[in-house]
Interface confidence: low
């Protein structure tokens, strides 16, 4: 029998994709099919030359391309041929302006850090401005592509370039980037399809910002004289740079007066010997080179009078936040009264106080 | 309104690649979003294969960056999804989505498309 | 990464209420998640956006009787007065991002029955 589809004529431009179909005669068993080029078993290339069901898929077309391919079905019974299909691959329209680029010549000259706009609500990340000199032929590019990517070490050259079109000739606003970074930059011209040759690197170290979020899951509990607090960093994104240690800030009461403590490095726990019952209500804030950032919710826990009341009610040793702890305090003091809302409101005043004077360092 | 549409072959055989196209209408994929691919496999389990962005960035599921390639043409407003050596442990439909705000929730999603892999 | 946790399978009658949940591991109990609605042989539809301190947004014509929130490391779903069109796959997602790597899970699914 005869193929089922033959592979076509096919007229392609340079960088385009092409595919090359080819359906072999009923047989059994089933055909498989290979692919050959001017009488040559073809090469495959993953992601460039690959063959998907029967069909030849070959993306980024190159003028080598071009040539003679045909489509071979082999099963216990023997081969039959395709037809032989004519592939022509041709300079694009772009080629002349591709040629043109080829002769640009970019000086990146300049990444200034911009200062952040002004707005309500969480601070923006940071912006650059780019701006550089063309020098070459007098047809300039018709855009610009900014190429950036961020630089962990001096010798790490694994990260992907992120491209973003910029909007001017000569210099333009980039946005993107997050603070505490390292950052590569340069630019690329192109008309079209056809691209220019890269302009020069560039670094700028973006600042460290304090950390735009408090670290998560801040949890307390007790244990052998002792209240540990525990917590997660923030989330990666609000680092702003590297997260350098952790200020655990108390509230005040008659058994813990008000204080702060600095936790350096890596490490999300803090160990607060007491052995006085009371109310005990922490946060933490992640330290950046420039300071502290954004303190998390209060937590609270509350260590009983005495180990028999302990015994009596299940709800041992118990985290809260502050706007669970008068509910609580209230039912395990049987009900309203007793000065409690007065402590809870005091409580609170001094929370506003500490936390504005903290932000007041900062 | 946005409007994504899934196409590739039904069938693929053991150890081949998997290509899949995604046509958007309605919005440039080069103007903003992240332009997802998602499968669905026969248990229902949903897993997130990997984004380009509209700036060209991309990021993959680690358990498949040694063989998923994630690419776009601008010019015809589709994006790619190519998988190497695929076994029938890759038998899904293939989803392509994006979000129409916050990122990674996905608002908009193609039709899906059911890939077989099979001798 | 963060893992989310589902039940496999829940049901409720025609104009009652059910509450779906989504469990995230402890390391991201704080995390905000995603709820998608799937009924057989469509894309899953996305229907809303839980944050962890239980605020929630509805995607565009999503109906009053879908409300999210949220206790810990639990999200919610709520379906009240249910009708037969509830019945579907409910699936919540959460987006990550792991020294600079962004990336998105999804749980397994709870298949909703309406009795």
């Known amino acids: 029998e005869d193929f089922q589809i033959q592979p076509r004529d096919t007229v392609a431009v340079v960088g385009e994709s092409l595919v090359l179909e080819c359906g072999p005669p009923w047989g059994y068993p089933k055909p498989s099919v290979s692919w050959w080029k001017d009488g040559k078993p073809l090469v495959l290339q993953p992601g460039r030359r690959t063959v998907s069901g029967d069909s030849l898929m070959v993306s980024r077309a190159e003028k080598n391309d071009s040539g003679t391919y045909m489509c071979m079905a082999t099963n216990n019974a023997g081969q039959r041929e395709s037809r032989a299909a004519r592939v022509s691959i041709q300079e694009s329209q772009d080629h002349k302006e591709h040629l043109e680029l080829l002769a640009v010549r970019i000086q990146l000259e300049n990444v200034t850090l911009l200062n952040p706009e002004p707005v309500k609500g969480p601070k923006p990340g940071p912006s650059v401005w780019l701006s550089w000199k063309v020098s070459g032929p007098a047809a300039p590019a018709e855009s610009y592509t900014a190429l950036f990517r961020t630089q962990r070490s001096p010798r790490d050259q694994g990260s992907p370039w992120t491209e973003v079109l910029l909007r001017g000739l000569q210099s333009a606003k980039l946005g993107g980037l997050h603070w505490g970074q390292d950052y590569e930059f340069k630019v690329r011209p192109s008309s079209g399809r056809a691209r220019g040759p890269d302009s020069n690197v560039l670094l700028l170290r973006l600042p460290e910002q304090v950390p735009s979020a408090p670290p998560q899951g801040v949890t307390l509990r007790s244990g052998n004289g002792s209240v540990f607090v525990s917590w997660a960093p923030p989330p990666a994104e609000s680092h702003n740079g590297v997260i350098r240690g952790y200020q655990v800030w108390s509230l005040g009461n008659a058994s813990l007066p008000a204080a702060n403590w600095t936790v350096v490095g890596e490490q999300t726990q803090l160990e607060i010997a007491t052995r006085l019952p009371g109310s005990y209500c922490v946060q933490v804030a992640a330290v950046t080179g420039a300071g502290a950032g954004e303190l998390s919710t209060p937590v609270c826990l509350l260590l009983e009078q005495a180990m028999e009341q302990s015994a009596r009610d299940p709800r041992k040793h118990v985290p809260w936040t502050l706007e669970q702890l008068r509910v609580d305090l209230e039912v395990l003091f049987q009900g309203p009264g007793s000065g409690l809302n007065d402590i809870f409101e005091a409580q609170k005043i001094e929370w506003h106080e500490a936390r504005a004077h903290h932000h007041h360092h900062h | 309104q946005i409007q994504l549409q899934e196409s590739g072959p039904g069938l693929v055989k053991p150890s081949q690649s998997l290509s899949l196209t995604c046509s958007v209408t309605?919005?440039?994929?080069?103007?903003?979003?992240?332009w997802t691919w998602i499968r669905q496999f026969p248990g229902n389990n949903l897993e997130w294969m990997g984004y380009?962005?509209?700036?060209?960035?991309?990021d993959y599921n680690p358990s498949l960056t040694s063989r998923i390639s994630i690419t776009r043409d601008t010019s015809r407003n589709q994006f790619f999804l190519q998988l190497e050596s695929v076994t029938t442990q890759d038998t899904a439909t293939y989803y392509c989505?994006?979000?129409?705000?916050?990122?990674?929730?996905?608002?908009?999603w193609g039709q899906g498309t059911m890939v077989t892999v099979s001798s | 990464q963060p893992v989310l946790t589902q039940s496999p399978s829940a049901s409720a009658s025609l104009g009652a209420s059910v509450k779906l949940t989504c469990t995230l591991n402890?390391?991201?109990?704080?995390?905000?998640i995603g709820w998608y609605q799937q009924h057989r042989d469509k894309p899953p539809k996305y229907v809303m956006f839980?944050?962890?301190?239980?605020?929630?947004s509805k995607a565009d014509g999503i109906p009053d009787r879908f409300s999210g929130s949220s206790s810990g490391a639990d999200r919610y779903l709520t379906i009240s007065n249910i009708q037969a069109e509830d019945e579907a796959i409910y699936f919540c997602?959460?987006?990550?991002?792991?020294?600079?790597?962004?990336?998105?899970?999804f749980g397994s699914g709870t298949h909703f029955t309406v009795l």
């Open positions: 380009i962005s509209y700036a060209g960035g991309i």
């Open positions: 309605g919005y440039s994929i080069s103007s903003g979003s992240l």
């Open positions: 989505a994006t979000p129409g705000g916050y990122p990674f929730h996905f608002d908009y």
């Open positions: 402890s390391q991201f109990s704080t995390y905000n």
């Open positions: 839980v944050k962890g301190d239980g605020g929630h």
């Open positions: 997602g959460a987006d990550y991002n792991n020294a600079g790597q962004y990336g998105c899970v």
